[in-house]
Amino acid sequence: AGVFELQIHSFGPGPGPGAPRSPCSARLPCRLFFRVCLKPGLSEEAAESPCALGAALSARGPVYTEQPGAPAPDLPLPDGLLQVPFRDAWPGTFSFIIETWREELGDQIGGPAWSLLARVAGRRRLAAGGPWARDIQRAGAWELRFSYRARCEPPAVGTACTRLCRPRSAPSRCGPGLRPCAPLEDECEAPLVCRAGCSPEHGFCEQPGECRCLEGWTGPLCTVPVSTSSCLSPRGPSSATTGCLVPGPGPCDGNPCANGGSCSETPRSFECTCPRGFYGLRCEVSGVTCADGPCFNGGLCVGGADPDSAYICHCPPGFQGSNCEKRVDRCSLQPCRNGGLCLDLGHALRCRCRAGFAGPRCEHDLDDCAGRACANGGTCVEGGGAHRCSCALGFGGRDCRERADPCAARPCAHGGRCYAHFSGLVCACAPGYMGARCEFPVHPDGASALPAAPPGLRPGDPQRYL
């Protein structure tokens, strides 16, 4: 048993260009707090996988208000260490996630709003009882400086906190076969007494009274070979009398997982999947209660009044996860219609509509042409929120009020010749093209999309078209 300790030294803008904007403002003062999540081994698990070694929340830091015009400084931090107690042996290798959270203290409806500001993660080797290890991690433009260590809780000592020490009974030396407890030379290593009858060949213990089995063995005293089938499996020691495998109980027999955890066999022994609020090898550790405020983003904590009962976070709209730590990207559902811009404000969704559209989801198409006339015979066209005039030949501009050279815009397609005329323009088409503006090839070459002037077209017979 022992405690992992984390000391945050600073959180602020990292070096280099692109300094982040201050997370707080005069209108929205805020304060920071931190969450640490520990997992055994060098796993690269997802952020939301269980913190099997434990988790901790810091206190809230001092309230900070940005000074207008000043660069974002290192932000004021909460006092004290983050401590994560561990009940079993310290694994030596571990993964960590450290999250920096911002609590906004403005005029929020329904209390303060929390948002994740930065998340750093890493995998480290660390012996218990060693000195503080210093670390610097960057998340985007932010930089987090911190130190950490693992220390054993008496009477445990050693790099894994599995050796036990007791004060010396005699001042001069330790008892027979027992060594002094480095670095506590005035204490002696205590003999580790396993459960009575624990197999010396197939069992071992890390704490007194325990009997843990080596791979391939099971039972309370590790005397029963593991097997999955009585006669069909070719593995395992066979019984001299039957030639069959001895049907030993599996590692999940009797369900070693506490607090409603579910057991699954692994190649080495077993694994417990723990319910929320519990962790540890057998789900026996419950380090988080509702009093610790485990529910982020305004989540409501239910149950978990004492360390032996699980808590459940009821998340507000827009958040999910066992601790309401994950923001639901509600804009990914594209709720805003007609090209509206989606804004997820946390407590609500807003759609910023394009011109010509209105309504909570931009579902109402306003009549862009209402009350807007196009001059000189032009026709008004609704064009995605901005009215547009399709002008009669010889006129141009937004409202067709400008007299234009009808041929200036090259209105004849496919190489047709344009002639200005009192009634507008006339296109003299190249051979093989038809239409008022030569836009129709008589015999296209069958391509799926032709350029403006497809090459190689033979002249058609204009007499065949009216």
Epitope: R388, A392, A413, G435, R437, E439, P444
Partner: nanobody
Amino acid sequence: EVQLVESGGGLVQPGGSLTLSCAASGETVSFLSLAWYRQAPGKKRELVAGISTDGSTVYFVSVKGRFTISRDNAKNSVYLQMNSLRAEDTAVYYCYAYSWTTPRAYWGQGTLVTVSS
């Protein structure tokens, strides 16, 4: 990019009628010149009827009076109403759009019209 999707093709008896529809997306049809082409087996694709942005039309001489091209800018669609159909009208009919903003031509995938008794 303009996308064109034709519909309305099928089997019809000589003398019968059929209306082809073409829905355009990607650009407002007010700024497109639209047309119907057809391609009979073993023959070149040929213009059947076209309608310019100003509403002026052009028709293949053998369909004039039988076929009518029209456009509905509000529905972003162009139609070909075909009456008094003949066996020689059997072909794959293609929707065509000429974009004046690109400028470039676009084609639909085609719809089969079979006139047979």
